[in-house]
């Protein structure tokens, strides 16, 4: 069956190997014909013909491993219902870095887990990030096939210290915004509590001055400024945070007594109602939704029901007198 | 260590009643919000009701409200589910749960039959 | 009420392997802060749930790392690196982005 005339050259689609002249005569309803499995991978149930709604599971060869849905459905027009499926190796290949930069350990693969530094020679450091983590068949973070070594400055500056700060001798400074930001960083949407306005910032910039300052500068979100939801609550948890009892460090964030940093991204999660801990004396009386009656909620319980822009009016700090 | 132990189910004819009981221990009861969680026989779980810290808020799927009533002692350190008017569709097994910053659902007890059959 | 849709139903097999399941949501379970929460449990051959995954790709306390969970918006997939023979179970996905919350209809995992 070719939904085009067979007076030329057979097609060959760009994903398959195999040329429409090449596939068995079969009817559209009575079944599909064997499904081209993907590089390194075989079909564990095979066989020529396929009935309509059999599924055909995908298996990789030893040293690699299905990624994706690996499942395939035969259709009734005969074709396949099939999802991105790939197999992709259990281990690590060494990766291709330029010249300047030195690979340790050094070795053709690693397995899950084993990470590798990148470094460079004397007075130069990795420009981006030095310590690679083998995840699969590929490295976290990805490997830049660009990356390459820059006049040691800010990482020298920085060494074992925390964000916005730099080495100086045996002990951790403040960055200078102005001299250790020149290089480039990803933007922030950043609250000023001082001028009590909202602004774009650097990141490089937005720590140094945060290490500063700590008290001034409150992160709102990853990304410009733009006005909607993301911005009105940023502000919100940061007018709510001056009583916060809680303050994690996350990131670029700071997790208060509603949140909880997350490991995998790094950033603040709002809890839900019910995960918030009964204590500490931050209460406040509101009133909920269209309800008239005052009820006494702690401030964790408060973050999480404006995070979830439920409805709610905070009438005064402190349990409600009724 | 959270030890949270149901009450023993049991079989009840439609339109019946019955109360279940959670006693909990390894944590301060009345510092958490508490909640029930069933499966039916052979069936995913569903969420059922939620109670706050004092017995003052609960809620409730939409399936069970009128009927079930979440409740709480506190000084018992034991949570209730008062279930009437009893379908053949409430049959199934009832777990107690406490959330954590984690989840909502991070500690379950180890589940109690209910069977709704004439 | 939201729908989690749980693929494949029942997962057959060898230790060793890799696995995947896909939990797909008939709406999206980002909310208007950047927040989504989808869980993972396993439940054991007559025991109670258990956690192993919170906040999309957050491994439970105690959760041992051959377990990871990924996507956004409405597909999400919780992979066992290495499956092991005391992985068998019932594998939920549960999100708490709208009320109720809901769970998907489980995939069982067998050995072979």
């Known amino acids: 069956f070719s939904i085009m005339e067979n007076n030329g050259q057979p097609c060959i689609n760009d994903d398959e190997e195999m040329k429409e002249v090449d596939l068995p005569e079969i009817e559209a309803d009575s079944g599909c014909p064997q499904p081209v499995p993907p590089e390194n991978g075989f079909i564990r149930n095979e066989k020529q013909l396929y009935l309509v709604g059999e599924d055909v599971e995908i298996s990789c060869l030893t040293g690699f491993e299905t990624v994706g849905y690996q499942y395939f459905r035969c259709l009734p027009d005969g074709t396949w219902r099939q999802g991105d499926v790939e197999c992709q190796r259990t281990e690590c290949i060494k990766p291709v870095v330029q010249e300047v930069l030195t690979i340790t350990p050094f070795q053709r693969l690693y397995r899950i887990g084993e990470s590798i530094e990148l470094t460079c020679p004397k007075g130069f450091v990795v420009a981006g990030p030095s310590r690679y983590t083998c995840q699969g068949n590929s490295w976290t973070p990805p490997i830049s096939n660009s990356l390459t070594c820059e006049k040691d400055t800010l990482t020298k500056l920085k060494g074992h210290c925390q964000l916005g700060q730099k080495q100086s001798g045996s002990e951790c400074i403040c960055m200078s915004p102005e001299e250790d930001c020149s290089h480039h960083s990803e933007d922030l949407c950043v609250f000023d509590t001082d001028s009590n306005d909202y602004f774009t910032s650097p990141a490089c910039k937005f720590l140094a001055e945060k290490c500063l300052n700590n008290q001034q500068l409150h992160f709102l979100h990853i990304g410009s400024c733009q006005d909607g939801r993301q911005l009105e609550w940023g502000l919100e948890r940061t007018r709510l945070s001056s009583n916060s009892t809680k303050k994690e460090s996350c990131g670029y964030d700071t997790c208060y007594d509603w949140e909880k940093c997350s490991a995998s991204t790094s950033k603040c999660v709002c809890l839900l109602p019910p995960q918030c801990f009964k204590g500490g004396n931050q209460l406040y009386c509101v009133k909920m939704g269209s309800s008239t009656s005052e009820k006494t909620l702690n401030i964790c319980e408060v973050g999480t029901i404006r995070c979830a822009n439920r409805k709610m009016e905070i009438l005064h700090p402190g349990k409600c007198l009724a | 260590e959270v030890q949270l132990v149901e009450s023993d189910g049991g079989l009840v004819q439609p339109g019946g009643s019955l109360r279940l009981s959670c006693v909990a221990s390894?944590?301060?009861?009345?510092?958490?919000?508490m909640a029930w969680v069933r499966q039916a026989p052979g069936k995913g779980l569903e969420w059922v009701a939620t109670?706050?810290?004092?017995?003052?808020?609960?809620y409730y799927r939409e399936s069970v409200k009128g009927r079930f009533t979440i409740s709480r002692d506190n000084a018992k350190r034991t949570l209730y589910l008062q279930m009437d008017s009893l379908r053949a569709e409430d049959t199934a097994v009832y777990y107690c749960a406490r959330p954590s910053t984690e989840a909502l659902f991070a500690y379950w007890g180890q589940g109690t039959l209910v069977t709704v059959s004439s | 009420d939201i729908v989690l849709t749980q693929t494949p139903l029942t997962l057959s097999v060898t230790p060793g392997q890799s696995v995947s399941i896909s939990c797909r949501s008939s709406?999206?379970?980002?909310?208007?802060?950047?927040?989504?929460?989808l869980y993972w449990y396993l439940q054991k051959p007559g025991q109670s749930p258990q956690l192993l995954i919170y906040l999309v790709s957050d491994l439970g306390s105690g959760v041992p790392n051959r377990f990871s969970g990924s996507g956004s918006g409405t597909d999400f997939t919780l992979k066992i690196s290495r499956v092991e023979a005391e992985d068998v179970g019932v594998y939920y996905c549960?999100?708490?982005?709208?009320?109720?919350?809901?769970f998907g209809a489980g995939t069982r995992l067998e050995i072979k």
């Open positions: 549960m999100q708490a982005s709208h009320a109720p919350y809901t």
């Open positions: 390894g944590f301060t009861f009345s510092d958490y919000y």
């Open positions: 709406q999206s379970l980002l909310n208007d802060v950047g927040n989504t929460y």
């Open positions: 109670i706050n810290y004092d017995g003052s808020s609960t």
